[in-house]
């Protein structure tokens, strides 16, 4: 996150860190006790079974009693994900156990299926453990920045016509650099307490207003998300699972 600030520890309890070989790699968010949403591109060249998901974290390098760590039992990328265009850049990670909900670990609500994205100018927040500058500086803890929704047609023009309707864009609202950066991918864009966007890609420089930040528009995938979750729930399961609605 560039141009942002460190959040109060555990004030974004839905945040998940996806790590490989002990290093944070992508973000994600908890929508169900067994499921985290992340970005499909995070697993284009990585074996999901080698990854770990950490919940309840603030400073990833510090051992915190609130942290819950899971391996990835299954990773379900959207069947129409296109690495060449980043279209349908969304993935569901099934945890190998059930998250224990509490003050530091909570679910994030999704938008209603096929809901219109927030109007242009709406203030939203994006958070993550990604770099805080183009120098690839790691953050001291979970970071967040306020951004504004940008009209998709304006954004598509800035991006030279590369976007599709299932994407969402934000900008700083001024000429300052504010937005997400490398390793924030998969994290949520939260507007009105719901995950309306999922961090997908940005331009040559983090937070550059000339190439606005691009997200997967979550509302376009709500049906698919719950279809996957439902299909994987074993009929004979006695364990109580909770989902955000």
């Amino acid at each position: 996150i560039v141009g942002g600030h460190e959040v109060t520890p555990h004030s974004r309890p839905y945040m998940a860190s996806v790590s490989f070989e002990g290093h944070h790699y992508c973000g994600g968010f908890l929508i169900h006790t067994h499921w985290v949403v992340s970005a499909a591109h995070c697993f284009s060249d990585r074996d999901p079974s080698m990854g770990l998901v950490v919940l309840g974290a603030h400073a990833l390098l510090a051992p915190e009693p609130t942290q819950q760590t899971f391996s990835i039992a299954a990773a379900v990328s959207h069947p129409d994900f296109q690495p060449a265009t980043q279209a349908n850049d969304i993935c569901l990670l099934r945890l190998n156990g059930s998250a224990v909900l509490g003050p530091a670990v909570r679910l994030l609500r999704l938008p209603r299926r096929n809901a219109k994205p927030p109007a242009a100018g709406t203030r939203c927040h994006v958070s993550g453990w990604g770099f805080v500058s183009d120098f690839e500086e790691p953050p001291p803890g979970l970071m967040e920045v306020e951004v504004r929704i940008l009209d998709l047609s304006v954004c598509n023009s800035s991006w030279q016509g590369q976007l599709n309707p299932a994407m969402l864009c934000t900008h700083s609202g001024d000429r300052r650099r504010r937005g997400f950066c490398s390793a924030d991918s998969g994290g949520p864009l939260v507007c009105g307490r719901r995950a309306h966007g999922l961090v997908s890609f940005s331009g040559l420089w983090c937070g550059d207003p000339k190439t606005p930040d691009v997200y997967t528009q979550v509302s376009a995938f709500v049906t698919w998300i719950w279809d996957v979750v439902r299909a994987s729930s074993s009929p004979g399961s006695t364990g109580r699972s909770v989902r955000a609605v």
């Epitope: 591109h41 490398s182 040559l204 550059d208």
Partner: antibody, heavy 119, light 107 residues
């Protein structure tokens, strides 16, 4: 050792096409953006195009937008520049370059390949 | 697009001289400026990034300074191998843009 080697340059008629390649070694594409920069004979440097580390997004100079396409094959660690509808003013040495950090600068450059557009 | 204007366009100097090249951006680019050296027939080489950071392996006689719109590349004591063309480049907002170059020649 990081190396970038361009190939594919040559003489082409106006309106013609050419595909340049940039073979990389000593680093992986998935960790670094790749750029093409050109230099017309006796002139300065002009940035042409960029492809992100994932290969999922691209950006072009206005002068080549709609005519040039940058792409990458991460399995081959090779980037490409497909140049269509070539014009005389596209005549230049074309360099591919690797990003330092998150595109802070271009820290490694290839030796360049000459493209001449002439009838 | 941001315009980068270098001055002078060329200069003559002797070995041992202190040489200063300036670059002015058409709008605020913070410290997002790099400097390159290019010799005839060769690819550019990175000298300085983010206005003042010396790139690995570059001799300490090269230094950079500035922020906002005005930037400077200084060679404290010119060496024979420093005769070349120098370019500044902004990496603040897309697209990246270069200055027109400054040719440093032997007096």
């Amino acid at each position: 050792e990081v190396q970038l080697v361009e190939s594919g340059g040559g003489l082409v008629q106006p309106g013609g096409s050419l595909r340049l390649s940039c073979a990389a070694s000593g680093f992986t594409f998935s960790g670094s953006g790749i750029h093409w920069v050109r230099q017309a004979p006796g002139k300065g440097l002009e940035w042409v195009a960029w492809i992100s580390p994932t290969g999922g997004n691209t950006y072009y100079a206005d002068s080549v937008k709609g005519r040039f396409t940058i792409s990458a094959d991460t399995s081959k660690n090779t980037a490409y520049l497909q140049m269509n509808s070539l014009r005389a003013e596209d005549t230049a040495v074309y360099y591919c370059a690797k990003s330092l950090f998150h595109n802070v600068a271009f820290d490694y450059w290839g030796q360049g390949t000459l493209v001449t557009v002439s009838s | 697009d941001i315009q980068m204007t270098q001055s002078p366009s060329s200069l003559s100097a002797s070995v041992g001289d202190r040489v200063t090249i300036t670059c002015r951006a058409s709008q605020d680019v913070s410290t997002a400026v790099a400097w390159y050296q290019q010799k005839p027939g060769k690819a550019p080489k990175l000298l300085i990034y983010s206005a003042s950071f010396l790139y690995s392996g570059v001799p300490s006689r090269f230094s950079g300074s500035g922020s906002g719109t005005d930037f400077t590349l200084t060679i404290s004591s010119l060496q024979p191998e420093d005769f070349a063309t120098y370019y500044c480049q902004q990496s603040y907002t897309a697209p990246p843009t270069f200055g027109q170059g400054t040719k440093v020649e032997i007096k």
